[in-house]
């Protein structure tokens, strides 16, 4: 059934996205979407004088914030307001509905059943993504962030899908594929979650996806001046060839034991290696 | 799991000559450690021979040693000692033995017996 | 470069304290390049403590050696009928030269 928008809401500048609704496109304004923007402000004649454009600004009317239910319309009186009730709504405030389920209120595929009480004349039982007295709103499903692990939510109306991340699956991205579980890394290493892959952090001296590779930590010969250098497990070890002292046998000893060095750094002896 | 493995041992003539064998798996030598030839004679105490250093090839010799052993890497995973002029105090137990840094023996072989003996 | 053991044989009873001694003829190298290793009967050395003092992964934390320079230690607190064996001491020195100690032997009743 069409969307049926407050009585009187001006077709050409206003429009409605679920019943009783009068919404006004730019540049209009007012209960109807009938008043230019451009001059509502200067056309009252209540209110106190804009300091900004001179005009006088609009104090709150009794039809301000639309008392009036159910698409009713408000017009101002001397003493109060008064709503035009649309076809099968009465009351004061168009509160009472005269609609019954000959009439087709539920939209959206939704259910009529009569009402049990005077003041309700209809329900409307609403399908799955769809609420409101009229089934007229749209229940974004999405807002309740069902995909997990950070995976996309599509509201396709008849089912919500989620488009997951690399490395999940399942229909709510609840299944981690890479994870570390009965994966081992070799040679002491320790499996890294993380993006959905799993990941060795590697013991000193291993490399590759699963620590199966050996690193040479003295691939680059860290030890100066003929220095050994030695891939022990707690880090490159250097043996200084004799006459030279240091952490990477860079410091030269003179025959008389002494630095080359104003002062040997502390805790350094002639062949000392690195600690 | 890494493990040396030595053979080529056996019974051998004094004067004779005889090439030992150490054979790694689980690790290779293209990372830098001292490969090292230790002996044991019956009853004694371990005495160091010889080392290669896998990093530059650069080998070193106990005194004794030096003109009658040769040390040297026949592959990535294999490290030979060469005997020659063999004499009956050379009869001992030969172990192949790596050292990772902190000049000590971390990993041994199980050892090959060699018999100098007429 | 000469590692000199004492004393040898040494007995504990089982829960006992055991000392043994290692003197080298010049200094290690870094002054604490010097290792510790059990042999038992048909076995190759097993390495206890490497650099003076550090126990070496998966072995009692009842081994504990110290010493620097040309003098070092073992001690083994609390001695178990497994500590049965013979221990070397081994020194690495400048110029890339290895050298062992003649062996102590470890009796534990």
């Known amino acids: 059934a069409p969307l049926v928008c407050r009585a009187g809401c001006s077709p050409e500048h206003g429009f409605c996205e679920q019943p009783g609704e009068c919404r006004c496109l730019e540049g209009w304004t007012g209960p109807l979407c009938t008043v230019p923007v451009s001059t509502s402000s200067c056309l009252s004649p209540r209110g106190p004088s804009s300091a900004t454009t001179g005009c006088l600004v609009p104090g709150p009317g009794p039809c301000d914030g639309n008392p009036c239910a159910n698409g009713g319309s408000c017009s101002e009186t001397p003493r109060s307001f008064e709503c035009t009730c649309p076809r099968g709504f009465y009351g004061l405030r168009c509160e009472v509905s005269g609609v019954t389920c000959a009439d087709g209120p539920c939209f959206n595929g939704g259910l009529c059943v009569g009402g049990a009480d005077p003041d309700s004349a209809y329900i409307c039982h609403c399908p799955p993504g769809f609420q409101g007295s009229n089934c007229e709103k749209r229940v974004d499903r999405c807002s309740l962030q069902p995909c997990r692990n950070g995976g996309l939510c599509l509201d396709l109306g008849h089912a919500l899908r989620c488009r997951c991340r690399a490395g999940f699956a399942g229909p709510r991205c609840e299944h981690d594929l890479d994870d570390c579980a009965g994966r081992a890394c070799a040679n002491g290493g320790t499996c890294v979650e993380g993006g959905g892959a799993h990941r060795c952090s590697c013991a000193l001296g291993f490399g590759g996806r699963d620590c199966r590779e050996r690193a040479d930590p003295c691939a680059a010969r860290p030890c100066a001046h003929g220095g050994r250098c030695y891939a022990h497990f707690s880090g490159l070890v250097c043996a200084c060839a004799p006459g030279y002292m240091g952490a990477r046998c860079e410091f030269p000893v003179h025959p008389d034991g002494a630095s080359a060095l104003p002062a040997a750094p502390p805790g350094l002896r002639p062949g000392d290696p690195q600690r | 799991q890494e493990q040396l493995v030595e053979s080529g041992g056996g019974l051998v003539q004094p004067e004779g000559s005889l090439t030992l064998t150490c054979t790694a798996s689980g690790f290779s030598f293209s990372s830098s450690y001292d490969m090292c030839w230790v002996r044991q004679a019956p009853g004694k105490g371990p005495e160091w021979i010889a080392c290669?250093?896998?990093?530059?090839?650069?080998t070193d010799y106990a005194s004794w040693a030096k003109g009658r052993f040769t040390v040297s890497k026949a592959s990535s995973t294999t490290v030979t000692l060469q005997m020659t002029s063999l004499a009956v105090a050379d009869t001992a137990t030969y172990f192949c033995?790596?050292?990772?840094?902190?000049?000590?023996?971390?990993?041994w072989g199980p050892g090959t017996l060699v018999t100098v003996s007429s | 470069q000469v590692l000199t053991q004492t004393p040898s044989p040494v007995s504990a009873a089982v829960g006992g304290t055991v000392t043994i001694s290692c003197q080298s003829t010049?200094?290690?190298?870094?002054?604490?390049?010097l290792s510790w290793y059990q042999q038992k009967p048909g076995q190759p050395p097993k390495v206890l403590i490497y650099q003076a003092s550090n126990l070496e992964i998966g072995v009692p934390s009842r081994f504990k050696g110290s010493g620097s320079g040309t003098q070092f230690t073992l001690t083994i607190s609390g001695a178990q009928c497994d500590d049965a064996a013979t221990y070397y001491c081994?020194?690495?020195?400048?110029?890339?030269?290895?050298?062992f100690g003649g062996g102590t032997e470890v009796v534990v009743k």
């Open positions: 010049e200094s290690v190298y870094g002054s604490d390049w």
């Open positions: 290669i250093y896998t990093g530059d090839g650069s």
């Open positions: 033995a790596r050292n990772s840094g902190y000049g000590y023996f971390g990993l």
């Open positions: 081994q020194g690495y020195y400048s110029g890339y030269i290895y050298a």
